[in-house]
């Protein structure tokens, strides 16, 4: 292990299409991968008229955009599908939207998925 970096071994799992995909709807996902790769957690969601609809959560591939991010935060301005990733066990339990280009307050507080 490399000191000073949060190892990701498991992430919160969620699949909105669990019935169609024949997966669990929610749970904890162990993160596997090649030994030389970093692993991350992620969350994908939509904002439908102010209501948060989670699409997926789980483990994510080695991705430089996720390095050293302890919190799962989407920074893109008004995407149709929100995405964030982070490092650290279960770091995707909560996720936030803080658009980089805006000066105003964030449009949504950190979100915790409903069980």
């Amino acid at each position: 292990a490399i000191l000073g970096r949060s190892e990701t071994q498991e992430c919160l799992f969620f699949n909105a299409n669990w019935e169609r995909d024949r997966t669990n709807q929610t749970g904890v996902e162990p993160c596997y991968g090649d030994k030389d790769k970093r692993r991350h957690c992620f969350a994908t969601w939509k904002n439908i008229s102010g209501s948060i609809e989670i699409v997926k959560q789980g483990c994510w591939l080695d991705d430089i955009n996720c390095y050293d991010r302890t919190d799962c935060i989407e920074k893109k301005d008004s995407p149709e599908v929100y995405f964030c990733c982070c490092e650290g066990n279960m770091c995707n339990e909560k996720f936030s939207y803080f658009p980089e280009m805006e000066v105003t307050q964030p449009t949504s507080n950190p979100v915790t998925p409903k069980p």
Partner: antibody, heavy 120, light 107 residues
């Protein structure tokens, strides 16, 4: 070194069956989801089916649903594709490919493929 | 199903050229976009995953960009070994779908 080796392809008549195998080595097979992707002669890539690391979850393209069955034997490090009721349009090179998770399915390693020809 | 549209379907370029291939999804797929390189008679090879991440062993002249519906694969300085067909693929939703491919040929 990661290696995937497909076998079981060949010539079969319409309505016939074939079972493809993919032998995996060089990685912990039971940690990874696996997929079958095919490519008809001179055409592009078409995803066929996928299975998660322990065989609990499977998914199929509409074009093969009800005819093809994906499975795996982690004790043998082998992925399978049972193909029934084969049609001429199933003629293709079939590749097995490794994926890390069900939801971030970048296919990072591929076998060299096995040719399935469906013809009378 | 999510449709993936690549353009152009083919292009001619010279060694050293900067080459750009685009891929458009029929709906937003966030960053669930991968690029593959395939040479005749060979299996596809992963080049870019998660829209921007370089796969292991792939030269840094390859780069990916985009999110949502519009994505780009760029080869900054085309090398002889880069002449091949390139495919985009979405992994946002089942079924996984590929673009029709872009054949990069020698001018």
């Amino acid at each position: 070194e990661v290696q995937l080796l497909e076998s079981g392809g060949g010539l079969v008549q319409p309505g016939g069956s074939l079972r493809l195998s993919c032998a995996a080595s060089g990685f912990t097979f039971s940690d990874y989801g696996m997929n079958w992707v095919r490519q008809a002669p001179g055409k592009g890539l078409e995803w066929v089916s996928g299975i998660n690391y322990n065989g609990g979850y499977t998914s199929y393209a509409d074009s093969v649903k009800g005819r093809f069955t994906i499975s795996r034997d982690n004790s043998k490090n082998t992925l399978y594709l049972q193909m029934n009721s084969l049609r001429a349009e199933d003629t293709a090179v079939y590749y097995c490919a490794r994926a890390a998770n069900w939801h971030d399915t970048a296919l990072d390693y591929w076998g060299q493929g096995t040719l399935v020809t469906v013809s009378s | 199903d999510i449709q993936m549209t690549q353009s152009p379907s083919s292009l001619s370029a010279s060694v050293g050229d900067r080459v750009t291939i685009t891929c458009r999804a029929s709906q937003s797929i966030s960053r669930y976009l991968n690029w593959y390189q395939q040479k005749p008679g060979k299996a596809p090879k992963l080049v870019i995953y998660a829209a921007t991440s370089l796969a292991s062993g792939v030269p840094s002249r390859f780069s990916g960009s985009g999110s949502g519906t519009d994505f780009t694969l760029t080869i900054s300085s085309l090398q002889p070994e880069d002449f091949a067909t390139y495919y985009c693929q979405q992994s946002y939703d089942n079924p996984l779908t590929f673009g029709g491919g872009t054949k990069v040929e020698i001018k």
